[in-house]
């Protein structure tokens, strides 16, 4: 089984643009890293800007689901 832990200080630069870094702890596989991106950014490492139009659409969808 695997679980997420926050990245160590030295690993935090895996994610950019303020993304929060997590390590996937899995005994059967090498460590993998995941990023939780700040609003306005996307991609595996939070490298890409999300166009404002798309951001607004996402917010609208969130509100609709609530």
């Amino acid at each position: 089984t695997s679980h997420l832990v926050k990245c160590a200080e030295k690993e935090k630069t895996f994610c950019v643009n303020g993304g929060e870094c997590f390590m996937v702890k899995d005994l059967s596989n090498p460590s993998r890293y995941l990023c939780k991106c700040q609003p306005g950014f996307t991609g595996a490492r939070c490298t890409e800007n999300v166009p404002m139009k798309v951001q607004n659409q996402e917010k609208a969808e969130e509100l609709y689901q609530k």
Partner: antibody, heavy 116, light 107 residues
């Protein structure tokens, strides 16, 4: 052993095109972040472009946006830099580098000269 | 874009000297700063990442410190092979940006 080998540099006229390649080996290509960095003769390092092979995310320096295109072929473990509308100021040694928590591995570089 | 300003742009030192190079970011970059060494005709080599962590295989005479906007690379006892140009680089935001370099020359 991690290895990055750039190729495709050469002499090209202003307005011309070149495609640089960065062949990678010794690591999980899809799990990294690949950068192109250039260095004009006698000058410092200038970041050019980057791609995350895992999802195809790309970034470009303003100086090359609309002229250069970065891409990656995960089946060949190779990154590319397609350079169009080349200018004299693009003359430089072009390096590819992998990034895990910083730019940890660099190729030997390939020289691009833009001149008539 | 974030500007990285290195100082000094060059310095002369002798073998055994303690050398300090500073790098100032134009805005907060947390600890997302790396330092590289480059010798003429060669590719840069990573020395320090995440502001203070020594990269694998790099001699312990190299150290890094700082957070926020001010960062330092220190060589505790300069060796003949350390004469080179050093660059700082931030990766807190895209685009990543480099300092202009500091050339360490023999006195």
């Amino acid at each position: 052993e991690v290895q990055l080998v750039e190729s495709g540099g050469g002499l090209v006229q202003p307005g011309g095109s070149l495609r640089l390649s960065c062949a990678a080996s010794g690591f999980t290509f899809s799990g990294t972040w690949i950068h192109w960095v250039r260095q004009a003769p006698g000058k410092g390092l200038e970041w050019v472009a980057a791609i995350t092979p895992a999802d195809g995310s790309t970034n470009y320096a303003d100086s090359v946006k609309g002229r250069f295109t970065i891409s990656a072929d995960t089946s060949k473990n190779t990154a590319y830099l397609q350079m169009n509308s080349l200018r004299a100021e693009d003359t430089a040694v072009y390096y590819c580098a992998t990034y895990m928590f910083a730019m940890d591995y660099w190729g030997q570089g390939t020289l691009v000269t833009v001149s008539s | 874009d974030i500007q990285m300003t290195q100082s000094p742009s060059s310095l002369s030192a002798s073998v055994g000297d303690r050398v300090t190079i500073t790098c100032r970011a134009s805005q907060d970059v947390s600890t997302a700063v790396a330092w590289y060494q480059q010798k003429p005709g060669k590719a840069p080599k990573l020395l320090i990442y995440s502001a203070s962590f020594l990269y694998s295989g790099v001699p312990s005479r190299f150290s890094g410190s700082g957070s926020g906007t001010d960062f330092t690379l220190t060589i505790s006892s300069l060796q003949p092979e350390d004469f080179a140009t050093y660059y700082c680089q931030q990766s807190y935001t895209t685009p990543p940006t480099f300092g202009q370099g500091t050339k360490v020359e023999i006195k």
